[in-house]
């Protein structure tokens, strides 16, 4: 069977009782629909002895198999089998296309990999596979960060990928650290970028029939050095019931990598600050920014001792940034709360 | 169907060397990168090693960056991890897995295969 | 390289139970996320790649969002073969840092 703008085995009509296996070669990114039993009473489609579900880019429906945009790993054994029972309806194999030999004797050699020749492929420029993955076409990251420009395509005879930056031949030779050519996943990778990667960077993507290119654009935000940024309202003033569970949120953005402590103000001798100035606290948790859930503080089954002032304390390289809130302890039936007004529960 | 079976586990003592290999079955082999995992007891996932499909492109953990080293036979439908200079803290299941096409999602792994290090 | 950062790394839930695990990276990864689960003595197991991609064969219940910097797992009925640990995994650099996962206990 040569592939065709839409492989398809139509109309859906009951099968012929005499059936035999088939081999479908099918292009990368093509639609398929495949028809089994007559629609109202479809067989059911199952891809290496897995029923296929009614929705999804792969989907069993209605006695169809329908494929949205034919990916390599579609590639393998379907079988369609009649509902109610175990008979085979439709046993068929879905062949890749660029992995077969094509008739064509100026293909591009990597299209020649298969000697069985069973089937010839038409000849395809290069489309895009996943223009998703390229809706973002200006990249501003900071200094130091990694970049990754993609351009997924297909075509036959498969194209190649090149890169060119501001319109020149790019193979990273005079770059820092160099590049990382991903072919198969039609990526350049840059890693700890600087200011001197800003630019244009261009995929073109190419074979014997036609070429098609994208540009992308690199802006690199050179860092300021800065002590922690601490997200305004964080930690939030607290109101709690006794026996209950509290969280306090800290969010910290920093460079440099950071270092975060929850303190909580405690009081010694009936003073809150000793001779230096400084207040009196108590460490609860200590970590750095990478380690889980450092940036909450969890109270479990809260007291009346729990209450009392909370520090959020960030530090870097750089220097300190801190934030405080106050957690407020009632009693579990405690009239004044329920008469008290909403305003009064709260205070900032 | 898919199939990747790993093999060449076993105890080594430190600064030995060990060459794992993984066969695959079921799929075009040279038309997907394949991967290295290890999880060393009792821990997390790590990620140790990638090829190309055609072995055009490999790159490395940096924690085993200059001792390991990633090849593959298309004929042969295989890939290896051969690693040398071993330590301690390379003591680990090892797994060989598949990367999906046009992602680095891995959509099929091995079983694994124990690595220890030990005098 | 970019560190991948899980929260929390251990929940109790219950069948039927809503779960929501997040991962976190140190930079902006795009969409470059999977998310996989690993039981007791096996290979892991991909639910979801490229962030918000059901794996072929992976029940329904299994979802995936986020972009950038900041990416959630969500099951929304927690069945008893759910159990297990759940790690994400980033493929924006080179080296694919996984996250250092999460346990889903029964309460």
């Known amino acids: 069977l040569e592939a065709s703008e839409e492989v398809e085995l139509e109309p859906c009509l009951a099968p012929s009782l005499e059936q035999q296996e088939q081999e479908l070669t099918v292009a990368l990114g093509q639609p398929v629909r495949l028809c089994c039993g007559r629609a109202e009473r479809g067989g059911h489609w199952y891809k290496e002895g897995s029923r296929l579900a009614p929705a999804g880019r792969v989907r069993g429906w209605r006695g169809r198999l329908e494929i949205a945009s034919f990916l390599p790993e579609d590639a393998g054994r379907y079988l369609c089998l009649a509902r109610g029972s175990m008979i085979v309806l439709q046993n068929l194999t879905l062949i890749t296309g660029d992995s077969l030999t094509s008739s064509n004797d100026d293909e591009d050699p990597k299209s020649h990999r298969d000697p069985s020749n069973r089937h010839s492929y038409p000849q395809q420029a290069p489309y895009w596979t996943h223009p998703q993955r390229m809706e973002k076409k200006l990249h501003a990251v900071p200094a130091g960060n990694t970049v990754k420009f993609r351009c997924p395509a297909a075509g036959n005879p498969t194209p190649t990928i090149r890169w060119l930056k501001d319109g020149q031949a790019f193979h990273g030779e005079n770059r820092i650290g160099g590049i990382r050519l991903r072919h198969q996943h039609w990526s350049l990778v840059m890693e700890s970028v600087v200011p001197s990667d800003r630019g244009t960077y261009t995929c073109l993507v190419e074979n014997a029939v036609g070429s098609i290119r994208y540009n992308y654009l690199l802006d690199v935000l050179e860092r300021s050095p800065h002590r922690p940024i601490l997200q305004a309202g964080l930690p939030a003033n607290t109101t709690a019931v006794v026996g209950s569970d509290v969280e306090l949120l800290c969010k910290v953005y920093s460079d440099a990598q950071p270092h975060i402590q929850w303190l909580k103000h405690i009081v010694i001798n009936g003073s809150s600050f000793g001779a230096d100035g400084f207040p009196y606290v108590q460490v609860l948790k200590t970590a750095d920014i990478n380690s889980s859930e450092v940036e909450v503080l969890y109270l479990r089954n809260v007291s009346a001792e729990d209450a009392g002032e909370y520090t959020c304390l960030a530090g870097n390289s750089i220097g300190l940034s801190y934030q405080s809130a106050w957690l407020t302890v009632l009693p579990e039936e405690d009239p004044t709360w329920t008469a008290a007004a909403p305003e009064a529960r709260y205070t900032d | 169907q898919v199939q990747l079976l790993e093999s060449g586990g076993g105890l080594v003592q430190p600064g030995g060397s060990l060459r794992l290999s993984c066969a695959a079955s079921?799929?075009?082999?040279?038309?997907?990168?394949m991967s290295w995992v290890r999880q060393a007891p009792g821990k997390g996932l790590e990620w140790v090693s990638v090829i190309e499909g055609d072995g055009s492109y490999t790159h490395y953990a940096d924690s085993v960056k200059g001792r390991f080293t990633i090849s593959r036979d298309n004929s042969k439908n295989t890939l290896y991890l051969q690693m040398n200079s071993l330590r301690a803290e390379d003591t680990a299941v090892y797994y060989c897995?598949?990367?999906?096409?046009?992602?680095?999602?891995?959509?099929?792994w091995g079983q694994g295969t124990l690595v220890t290090v030990s005098s | 390289d970019i560190q991948m950062t899980q929260s929390p790394s251990s929940l109790s839930a219950s069948v039927g139970d809503r779960v929501t695990i997040t991962c976190r990276a140190s930079q902006d990864i795009s969409s470059d996320l999977n998310w996989y689960q690993q039981k007791p003595g096996k290979a892991p197991k991909l639910l979801i790649y490229?962030?918000?991609n059901l794996q072929s064969g992976v029940p329904s219940r299994f979802s995936g969002s986020g972009s950038g910097t900041d990416f959630t797992l969500t099951i929304s009925s927690l069945q008893p073969e759910d159990f297990a640990v759940y790690y994400c995994q980033q493929h924006y650099s080179p080296s694919h840092t996984f996250g250092q996962g999460t346990k889903v206990e029964i309460k």
């Open positions: 079921g799929f075009t082999f040279s038309d997907y990168a």
């Open positions: 490229d962030a918000s």
């Open positions: 897995a598949r990367e999906k096409t046009y992602s680095s999602a891995f959509d099929y």
